[in-house]
């Protein structure tokens, strides 16, 4: 008789999830000499231990603490780039500007990027059929709690000038419900962080509006200012040119506004 299985609204665990996590871990530790000491079997065991045999709507940050401990990594605290709803460009930027880091450039972020996972209460099985959706099912699911945990720690580590890339094509350029808006903004440490600098990325070819005047950006400025952190904002009118100029800053066309 097939065992009754909870049907969730979200997609199931990414296929070959254990193999993918292990392979990514080995690859990361090979590329980053400072993380060579990391034991990927132990990382996978700790990752698995955070959600296996647990109800996928009852996951806590505490469940991920063994993984956080094993994945402890020091990134230059003044070289942190946060992003919201514009992941691809943020990652393209840090691939060029190698001394800056998004969360996905760290071991734990790299391991989990674009993956979904969940288990089932009281069984050691991974659920490849469905996983809880944050809105339709529950917020304390394995994926959401993981990103909340690593995002909080990443923001807490930041210092000096912190940059955030925001998507100017969205109706809410700054969204209070995004991970950036709900977690990272509130965990920047005023005693360490002097300024949050927002880069608003324009989507339209001929879009010359000053999106730094957008009401949601003003809302972000207000939240940040109340936390005793300075705020600044820049329009990135031409993201393609912006990336090109990061690659080749000496290019004569890079002195004009981008």
């Amino acid at each position: 008789v097939p065992r009754w299985r909870q049907q969730w609204s979200g997609p199931g665990t990414t296929k070959r999830f254990p193999e993918t996590v292990l392979a990514r871990c080995v690859k990361y530790t090979e590329i980053h000499p400072e993380m060579r000491h990391v034991d990927c079997q132990s990382v996978w065991d700790a990752f698995k231990g955070a959600f296996i045999s647990k109800h996928p709507c009852n996951i806590t940050e505490e469940d991920y603490q063994p993984l956080m401990k094993l994945g402890t990594q020091t990134v230059p605290c003044n070289k942190i780039l946060l992003w919201s709803r514009i992941k691809d460009l943020a990652h393209q930027f840090t691939q060029v500007q190698r001394d800056m880091f998004t969360l996905e450039d760290t071991l734990l972020g790299y391991l989990a990027d674009d993956l979904t996972w969940c288990g089932e209460f009281n069984t050691s099985k991974i659920n490849y059929q469905s996983c809880p959706d944050w809105r339709k099912d529950c917020s304390n699911n394995p994926v959401s709690v993981f990103w909340k945990t690593v995002s909080r720690r990443f923001a807490e580590a930041a210092c000096d000038v912190v940059h955030v890339m925001l998507n100017g094509s969205r109706s809410k350029i700054f969204d209070k419900n995004s991970t950036f808006g709900s977690v990272e903004v509130h965990n920047l440490q005023p005693e360490k962080v002097q300024t949050l600098e927002a880069w608003v990325i324009h989507g339209g070819r001929e879009d010359s509006r000053d999106l730094c005047q957008d009401p949601t950006i003003k809302e972000l400025e207000s939240i940040i200012s109340k936390r005793n952190i300075q705020f600044s904002c820049k329009n990135i009118y031409r993201p393609d040119k912006f990336l090109q100029c990061v690659k080749n800053p000496e290019d004569s066309s890079c002195t004009s506004e981008i």
């Epitope: 254990p18 193999e19 392979a23 080995v26 090979e30 000491h37 990391v38 034991d39 990927c40 079997q41 132990s42 065991d45 700790a46 231990g49 063994p66 094993l70």
Partner: antibody, heavy 118, light 110 residues
Framework: EVQLVESGGGLVQPGRSLRLSCAAS????????MSWVRQAPGKGLEWVAV????????YYADSVKGRFTISRDNSKNTLYLQMNSLRAEDTAVYYC????FGYGMDVWGQGTTVTVSS | QTVVTQEPSLTVSPGGTVTLTCASS?????????PCWFQQKPGHPPRALVY???TIHSWTPARFSGSLLGGKAALTVSGVQPEDEADYYC?????????FGGGTQLTVLG
């Protein structure tokens, strides 16, 4: 310097028990999976067991399953192998190895000899 | 019981090239088995040479290389030296458990 030192080997009669220890130093023992590997006289290497960094996951070779138990005490930086119901074919040099996933066993002890004979 | 098979013995002349292979009874060896290779000389514990299929350890001479070859893991020694005479073992990963190959005794002539 990373070092592993096995102890506890010796001559034991079939059916009896023995506990091997492996003292680790020079690395963060509590962050690594650890393994036992054995080598019978004149024979090849045989993987025996592995234990996760925190002791929660253990895997055994079929030949020792149900008779051997791998354990660890992270506060003492020590790995153990409890061997029960010993047989003549368990006679071997037992090595403790520092295991990094994907990197294989990059540090080995010198081994301790177990002889099972009446 | 998974069995990992290696050539029992191989002979090579100094300066020659030799390839040792490692096959799995469960099917083709892939990168998911994270093949590792070890060298062992009489009276000594094994020494890791190659990990993750094709990456050599910092202490491994450049004449050693790892690869996947026709569904098997392979260790190639190019420009064999007399000191390469030893037993060689592969190790495969099976989702927690590991299995060593039976070993290859490499003899360097002369």
């Amino acid at each position: 310097e990373v070092q592993l030192v096995e102890s506890g080997g010796g001559l034991v009669q079939p059916g009896r028990s023995l506990r091997l220890s492996c003292a680790a130093s020079g690395f963060t023992f509590s962050s690594y999976a650890m393994s036992w590997v054995r080598q019978a006289p004149g024979k090849g290497l045989e993987w025996v067991a592995v234990i996760s960094y925190d002791g929660s996951n253990k895997y055994y070779a079929d030949s020792v399953k149900g008779r051997f138990t791998i354990s660890r005490d992270n506060s003492k930086n020590t790995l153990y192998l409890q061997m029960n119901s010993l047989r003549a074919e368990d006679t071997a040099v037992y090595y403790c190895a520092h295991l990094r996933f994907g990197y294989g066993m990059d540090v080995w002890g010198q081994g301790t000899t177990v002889t099972v004979s009446s | 019981q998974t069995v990992v098979t290696q050539e029992p013995s191989l002979t090579v002349s100094p300066g020659g090239t030799v390839t040792l292979t490692c096959a799995s009874s469960t099917g083709a060896v892939t990168s998911d088995h994270y093949p590792c290779w070890f060298q062992q000389k009489p009276g000594h514990p094994p020494r890791a040479l190659v990990y993750s299929t094709d990456t050599i350890h910092s202490w491994t001479p450049a004449r050693f290389s790892g690869s996947l070859l026709g569904g098997k893991a392979a260790l190639t020694v190019s420009g064999v030296q007399p000191e390469d005479e030893a037993d060689y073992y592969c190790l495969l990963y099976y989702g927690g458990a590991r299995v060593f190959g039976g070993g290859t005794q490499l003899t360097v002539l002369g």
